[in-house]
Structures are given as C-alpha cells and as structure tokens.
C-alpha cells in the first residue's frame, strides 16, 4: 500500500470535486455543476461534462460555429438539463423558457418552441462522423497506420470498444472517423460514442478532460498528426425534424 | 507510521453513557475516513458507523442510530464515539481503523463493559 | 443490506497446506472486497484489500480473487503463523458488512 494510492482524484474526468468518504474510505468524485457521483473508471457522459463546464470560471473563449451540414452542433455551450443516469434529458430550455429537443449528444434536433414544446423521447445518435483536416505534412500518411493509430486511440484512450470505429477514411489532408453503435448493439457498460467523440474534440482542441494526463499527442510513425479543423456530423436513428425555413435557409 | 491509539477500558452502569476516543497519528487526520468496529467477546466484527473529519460527514449501521454519536476533533486528531443509554448487549470490544479504499489500520481497541 | 455468507466457519488444515475461504455476497459489489487477519486479543489487520490487491508487508502465499458475487481468500502454503480468524468485508455500499469468520486452527 503506497503513497500513490493515497491519491483520490477522478482520473477520467478533471471536472470534478473528489473526497475519500465513499463506504471503506471509497473515493467518491462528483462532477461539478451537478453533483452528481460520477464513475471514474469510465469516460464521463457528455451532459455531465457540459454542465461541469457551463459551472466552471468562465475565460475567454471564442465559440467555433461550424456551417451547417446536416446535424453539427451550431448552438456551442449550453447548460443542459441531465437524467438521474447523466443522459441529456430530450427537452432542453434556456432561461427565456425558449425549448428544444435534442439527441443522445445534445445536440438540437428541432426547431426552438416554448414550453408546451414535447420531446417525447431521447432520439439516439448511432452514427458520428468525425472529419478531420491535419496541418501539412512532407508526405501523406499511410493510411492503414493512420487507421490502426486512431482505432488503437479510440480503444485505448476512450476504452471504445473496437467494434464501433465502423471506419477511418482519408484523402490527404482530410480524415474522417465513423463511430457506430445502434441501441441493440450497446451492451451495459459499453462508451458511449458520442462520449468517446466528445472527448476526443475536446482532446483535439488542447483541452484534455483527463485529470493529469498528458494532452493528446497523436503520431503516426512517430509522425506528428496536427489538426487543424475538426467538423462533426451526428446522424439519429429517427431523423430530425426542422422546418422547411431553416433547411433553405 | 499510521498509529491509532485507543483510550482505555471502561466500566459503566446500565443505562450511562461512554464516550471513548481513537487519537490518530502519522497522517494528514483530515484526509481519512475513521471507521468504529464493534465486537463482541467471541463474536464477530460489526460495522457501527464512519466518520471524515474532513467534513464531519457521518454515517451510521442503522441499529446504532440513536445510540452512536460519531464526532472528530480537528485540533487534535482524534476521533470520538459515544454510547447512550447502555445495556449488557452493549458489552463489547470497539475498534476504530482509518480506511482507504478498503484498506485499514486498526487501533488497539478499546473494551467496554456494562454491569450494574 | 449486502448480506455476506462466508465459508467454512471453521477449518483444521497442516502446514504447507493450501488454504481457500470464501465469501458470497447477496449482490454484485464490483470487487470491494476486503480481507481481515485477526488473531486472539489483538485488533484485525489488512490482507487484501480490492478483492484482490495485497497490502504491502503481507507475504505473497496470501491472495485473493474473485468478482461479482463470488470471492475467495488462498493461502498457498499454510504457516504456523497464519492461525486466527479471518474475515471478508464488503465496502460496495452502506453499511458495510462482515462475513461471519473463519477460523483456521492447525490439524
């Protein structure tokens, strides 16, 4: 029993207030924001994160928008509302009593109502298409080490299991990860992969969620592999729902 | 070293009341939870309740509640239980540990015995 | 409560035996898990802890292993000095809970 032991800290998450007063002396960490006791042997869910984040000191910080191909994520921050579970509740609303629903990311999925707004359920995302453009290199990369880095990334990082890194696509300077998982083909204790995605841009824009780890160093052949735009695309099961204004606007 | 050092025996009435104390050493006294260990002569152990002083949060096995206080001195590391109206069934040994995840030191004991 | 069932109560084994204890819990506890030495007179000490991480100081012939419900205690080489009691202790949830002991007397 050593010292290092004695360390009770969230190793998965940073955003969070940690005490050894679980049952035994259990270190237990809950996230700020929420209070909620959070498993740290496992990634975070993202609405926990977001609340976590809306709750933190507020710096400076420029919101990327990103253009509108189908479901991106153009509303950045918002402080959400999260399920007993730490799922996004499917309806969410401002302080203005503006509502909307959103998907298993929390991503908006309709228009913006009021209150008598209903979601009548979390539409799950079950496909996440990551793209990526990396900064100029002397050489393309090759692309079944860029797959097997960013599969071995993936499972190893974010403990995805290997199955739902569907594909890893590129044609220089552009790569493109596609993240599956249906409802049926998520088993108790699986990642989530809309966690794994979150923290992975998180990750890609130099602000790791992992307490005292090192930022993500990505390298291929002991290439560095720099990225400098990252675009997500989210696709639900059930199709959203968003007037006819705002798909010709 | 981590060394919990219990006060002594005690003898008590019917129906007193004992406060006993679990002086903590070695350690930062704020960072760990202190448990009170209950045992009975050739029985074994039962779980009474826990402390961190770090924030004075308690918890209690639900047959001491009412009967334990479970208190922590910050000046002077020490941990405290007392016992409230007494009986024979309370006669035991009691112990208390600093846990960490499951792992313990115990102190010494300290034994308690309830006669008119 | 976590209720934890643990045997044998008691057992004779003879030097340089191997040794295994038991404990069922009534439900998954995710391998918080613990084990105690006590022997006559004296406070308990800490074996195992984490189902299976043994404490620094404690000789290698102790181990424990198990999940879920189900976890065990070996000594793989029973010394004269290994004779007490020894309890599991379950830490999942409050309250914590002892299983019953076992005492382990040379045969």
């Known amino acids: 029993h050593t010292a290092a032991q004695d360390n009770c800290t969230c190793p998965t998450n940073k955003m969070t207030v940690c005490s050894p007063d679980g049952p035994g002396g259990r270190c237990q960490c809950r996230a700020l924001g929420s209070g909620m006791a959070v498993d740290c042997s496992t990634l975070t869910s993202k609405c926990l994160l977001l609340k976590a984040r809306m709750s933190a000191p507020k710096n400076a910080r420029t919101l990327v928008r990103p253009s509108e191909h189908a479901l991106v994520d153009n509303d950045g921050l918002y402080d959400p509302d999260c399920d007993p579970e730490g799922r996004f509740k499917a309806r969410q609303c401002n302080q203005t009593s503006v509502c909307w629903c959103v998907n298993s990311v929390g991503v908006r999925r309709t228009d913006k109502g009021d209150l008598s707004l209903r979601c009548d359920e979390l539409v799950r995302t079950h496909h996440i298409l990551i793209d990526l453009r990396h900064r100029p290199t002397a050489g393309a990369f090759n692309h079944s080490d860029l797959d097997a880095e960013l599969r071995r990334l993936f499972r190893e990082r974010y403990r995805l299991h290997p199955k739902f890194v569907a594909a890893v696509h590129y044609e220089q300077p552009t790569i493109q990860i596609e993240l599956r998982q249906n409802t049926s083909q998520k088993a108790a204790g699986d990642v989530d992969i809309g966690d794994a995605a979150y923290y992975f841009e998180r990750d890609i824009k130099g602000e790791s969620l992992f307490q005292g780890r090192g930022g993500l160093d990505l390298r291929v052949r002991g290439e560095p592999l720099q990225v400098e735009r990252t675009l997500i695309y989210y696709l639900d099961e059930i199709p959203p729902k968003f007037s006819m204004k705002r798909l010709t606007a | 070293q981590v060394q919990l050092q219990q006060s002594g025996p005690e003898l008590v009435k019917p129906g007193a009341s004992v406060k006993m104390s679990c002086k903590a050493s070695?350690?930062?006294?704020?960072?760990?939870?202190i448990n009170w260990v209950k045992q009975r002569p050739g029985q074994g152990l039962e779980w009474v309740g826990q402390i961190y002083p770090g924030s004075d949060g308690t918890y209690y096995n639900e047959p001491f509640k009412g009967e334990a206080t479970l208190t922590a001195d910050k000046s002077s590391n020490t941990a405290y239980m007392q016992l409230s109206s007494l009986t024979s069934e309370d006669s035991a040994v009691y112990f208390c540990?600093?846990?960490?995840?499951?792992?313990?030191?115990w102190g010494q004991g300290t034994l308690v015995t309830v006669s008119a | 409560d976590i209720k934890m069932t643990q045997s044998p109560s008691s057992m004779f084994a003879s030097l340089g035996e191997r040794v295994t204890i038991t404990c069922k819990a009534s439900q998954d506890i995710n391998w918080y898990l613990s084990w105690f030495q006590q022997k006559p007179g004296k406070s308990p000490k800490t074996l195992i802890y984490?189902?299976?991480r043994l404490v620094d100081g404690v000789p290698s012939r102790f181990s424990g292993s198990g999940s879920g419900q189900d976890y065990s205690l070996t000594i793989s080489s029973l010394d004269y000095e290994d004779m007490g009691v020894y309890y599991c202790l379950q830490y999942e949830e409050f309250p914590l809970t002892f299983g019953a002991g076992t005492k382990l007397e040379l045969k």
């Open positions: 070695g350690y930062t006294f704020t960072d760990y939870v």
């Open positions: 984490r189902a299976n």
């Open positions: 540990a600093r846990f960490f995840e499951g792992f313990a030191y």
